[in-house]
Amino acid sequence: YDFTNCDFEKIKAAYLSTISKDLITYMSGTKSTEFNNTVSCSNRPHCLTEIQSLTFNPTAGCASLAKEMFAMKTKAALAIWCPGYSETQINATQAMKKRRKRKVTTNKCLEQVSQLQGLWRRFNRPLLKQQ
């Protein structure tokens, strides 16, 4: 999906008001310096591409993020404010549904959510030069 035509300001507002709080809740008890950010993005569409991938695609050691509250609200934001996004989702979630279970908070998942927080922060500051 090409995120170029999303309403970035509305997605940003939803992130700041709600999604960010859910990410913090997920990470509660974890030091903010515990993980190094290794995933980066260069502009808002790219950031959303990376955010979608990290949130909804199972990775080795962390297959459960797509069933978390922040993931549901992320999906809702992309579906509402990215034209045609919901039409691209036909097989994406179905394919991994059998493998997903909530409440398996592994260290790998915490690391992945830490990466997500970094991507979202970058999404909110699109005019900053890439480090």
Epitope: A14, S17, T18, T25, A76, A79, I80, E87, N91, T93
Partner: antibody, heavy 121, light 108 residues
Framework: QVQLQQSGAELVRPGSSVKISCKAS????????VNWVKQRPGQGLEWIGQ????????DYNGKFKGKATLTADKSSSTAYMQLSSLTSEDSAVYFC??????????????WGQGTSVTVSS | EIVLTQSPALMAASPGEKVTITCSVS???????LHWYQQKSETSPKPWIY???NLASGVPVRFSGSGSGTSYSLTISSMEAEDAATYYC?????????FGGGTKLEIK
Amino acid sequence: QVQLQQSGAELVRPGSSVKISCKASGYTFSSYWVNWVKQRPGQGLEWIGQIYPGDGDTDYNGKFKGKATLTADKSSSTAYMQLSSLTSEDSAVYFCARGTYYNNYYGTDYWGQGTSVTVSS
Amino acid sequence: EIVLTQSPALMAASPGEKVTITCSVSSSISSSNLHWYQQKSETSPKPWIYGTSNLASGVPVRFSGSGSGTSYSLTISSMEAEDAATYYCQQWSSYPLTFGGGTKLEIK
């Protein structure tokens, strides 16, 4: 304008199943989660689960797993909830409600009028 | 699961009286995830307050909401007859989503 129109009241036998519907109009059905809520007579509200019509993704309250099955048909913009192995405990009004962002806070905005299910022999 | 406990369960207020309904949450949640709904008999619940303190469209300004962590409240500065209803708090912080038991507010 946004509307959620639910199917009519049902009188069903114990042990049977019932499928109630929630037809959406006035918005892009596939882009919004649909929630289902139970209310027993004179009682409070209980969240059953939700479905994202875009890909059929679902989340259930563990209490209703095996009791409720949520589906959605994008072609008719209709969400469905099937209740199985009915008992008197399932006699209630069931609401569907759209999940959305309201002033950047995520919750439900539009609700259906409710479908009354009575389980009786 | 997160348990929401409302108090009182039932109350009556005179016109013009200040009313406060509380919602106690079993574990701390973000204020952005606490909402209030109003329900009148035989009708669907209506969104009333979002994110602890933001009034839904059409809600009179005599209503307000506040709170944080585990303690939230809905206040009516001056009770009116049309405010008689049942009010529910709800959390969107973690699954399963849960509601308070409701507070039935009657007019004296």
